[in-house]
C-alpha cells in the first residue's frame, strides 16, 4: 500500500498543542518523541507518515526527489522521496543524494575523479509529463566539465543546486544544466501551472531567493491567464 511505501520517506510533525494558535507561539507539548522547534507551531515527531506531494524536484528538500512512490504508479501521485545513496539504482541525477550523480542507472560519487581534470558525464533530460521516468522524448548530450572542490560559479556545469556556490541554483540551459543566480526581488520568475511543464523549459530560471515567492505582478492581475507576469515578491 501507499502507506507502507511512504513510511520511511517522510519527516513527521505534530499539530500544535491544545490552545496554541496556528502560527503563534504556544507551550511546547510533545505527544511523541521528536524535535520541537522553538516557538510557532513547528513540531517534528516520528508518529506517522506525512507524504509531501510535488510536481517537480525543486518542491522537495535537497535530500529528496519528486517521483511516484510506486513503480508504474498513478502519474497524478507524486511525492517527495528520500534520495538514493551511492550504488543505488537511479534514472536521473536528482534521485541521487548530494555529492552523487546518476551514471548508467547507478548513483555514483561526484568525487570519483577527485574533482580534478576532465570527466565525461551524460545528462539525460526527460520531456515526458511524468519526469520521474525516462519515458517520452529524451535527448542525450555529452558534456565535458571540470569539477573542483570549490562550488560552481555562475555558468559552471552542474548536476544539482548543491554543486553551485551560494546564491546560485542549478538550472537547465539548452540540454545541459548550469549554475544560475537565484532570483532577486522584482525579477521575473516562472510559476508552473501544469504538472510536468518545467520539463519543457530549455532556459530554466532559478527559484526566488529567501523571503521571496513567485507571484503575479500586481498590475498584471487583469491580463489574460497566459500573459500574466510573475515576479519575485516579499511574503
Amino acid at each position: 500500500t501507499l502507506n507502507s511505501v511512504l513510511n520511511s520517506n517522510a519527516i513527521k510533525n505534530l499539530p500544535p498543542p491544545l490552545g496554541g494558535a496556528a502560527g503563534h507561539p504556544g507551550s511546547a507539548v510533545s505527544a511523541a518523541p521528536g524535535i520541537l522547534y522553538p516557538g510557532g507551531n513547528k513540531y517534528q515527531t516520528i508518529d506517522n507518515y506525512q507524504p509531501y506531494p510535488c510536481a517537480e524536484d525543486e518542491e522537495c528538500g535537497t535530500d529528496e526527489y519528486c517521483a511516484s512512490p510506486t513503480r508504474g504508479g498513478d502519474a497524478g501521485v507524486q511525492i517527495c522521496l528520500a534520495c538514493r545513496k551511492r550504488r543505488k539504482r537511479c534514472m536521473r541525477h536528482a534521485m541521487c543524494c548530494p555529492g552523487n550523480y546518476c551514471k548508467n542507472g547507478i548513483c555514483v560519487s561526484s568525487d570519483q575523479n577527485h574533482f580534478r581534470g576532465e570527466i565525461e558525464e551524460t545528462i539525460t533530460e526527460s520531456f515526458g509529463n511524468d519526469h520521474s521516468t525516462l519515458d517520452g522524448y529524451s535527448r542525450r548530450t555529452t558534456l565535458s566539465s571540470k569539477m573542483y572542490h570549490t562550488k560552481g560559479q555562475e555558468g559552471s556545469v552542474c548536476l544539482r543546486s548543491s554543486d553551485c556556490a551560494s546564491g546560485l541554483c542549478c538550472a537547465r540551459h539548452f540540454w545541459s544544466k548550469i549554475c544560475k543566480p537565484v532570483l532577486k526581488e522584482g525579477q521575473v520568475c516562472t510559476k508552473h501551472r501544469r504538472k510536468g511543464s518545467h520539463g519543457l523549459e530549455i532556459f530554466q530560471r532559478c527559484y526566488c531567493g529567501e523571503g521571496l515567492s513567485c507571484r503575479i505582478q500586481k498590475d498584471h492581475h487583469q491580463a489574460s491567464n497566459s500573459s500574466r507576469l510573475h515576479t519575485c515578491q516579499r511574503h
Epitope: G23, N41, K42, Y52, C54, E59
Partner: nanobody
C-alpha cells in the same frame, strides 16, 4: 508566519457528505503544499490527503481513497476536503497543514510546518 483556519465540520449521518475548508493567511499560500490530517479520540493523528502547491499532484490515505477529494483555490488562499460516503470511523478532529516548499526554502526535507486548530467531524450511524 502562516495562519490556518478550518471550517465546515459538524455532525452528519453515515453515508452523508461534508466539505471542509481551510483558509490561509500570512505568507504566500500558493508556495505551500497543503495537507489534511485527522485525529480520533485516543488515537494517533493520521494523514488523510495532500495536494502540491500547483495542484498538479494529490495523494490520499488508503482509507479515504475514492471517497474524499482534496482541492485548492490559490486565488482564495483556500484548500478544501470534499468528504463523501462518510463512515462512523471518519469521526475525528480534522487538521489542515501547510508545507514549507522544501529546497526553495533551504531545507533538506519537505515537511508540514504550519497547522490549524482543527474542526470536529462526527459521523453518526
Amino acid at each position: 508566519e502562516v495562519q490556518l483556519v478550518e471550517s465546515g465540520g459538524g455532525l452528519v449521518q453515515a453515508g452523508g457528505s461534508l466539505r471542509l475548508s481551510c483558509a490561509a493567511s500570512g505568507r504566500t499560500f500558493s508556495s505551500y503544499a497543503m495537507g489534511w490530517f485527522r485525529q480520533a479520540p485516543g488515537k494517533e493523528r493520521e494523514f488523510v490527503a495532500a495536494i502540491s502547491w500547483s495542484g498538479g499532484s494529490t495523494v490520499y490515505a488508503d482509507s479515504v481513497k475514492g471517497r474524499f477529494t482534496i482541492s485548492r483555490d490559490n486565488a482564495k488562499n483556500t484548500v478544501y476536503l470534499q468528504m463523501n460516503s462518510l463512515k462512523p470511523e471518519d469521526t475525528a478532529v480534522y487538521y489542515c497543514a501547510a508545507g514549507n516548499g522544501g529546497r526553495t526554502y533551504g531545507h533538506s526535507r519537505a515537511r508540514y510546518d504550519y497547522w490549524g486548530q482543527g474542526t470536529q467531524v462526527t459521523v453518526s450511524s
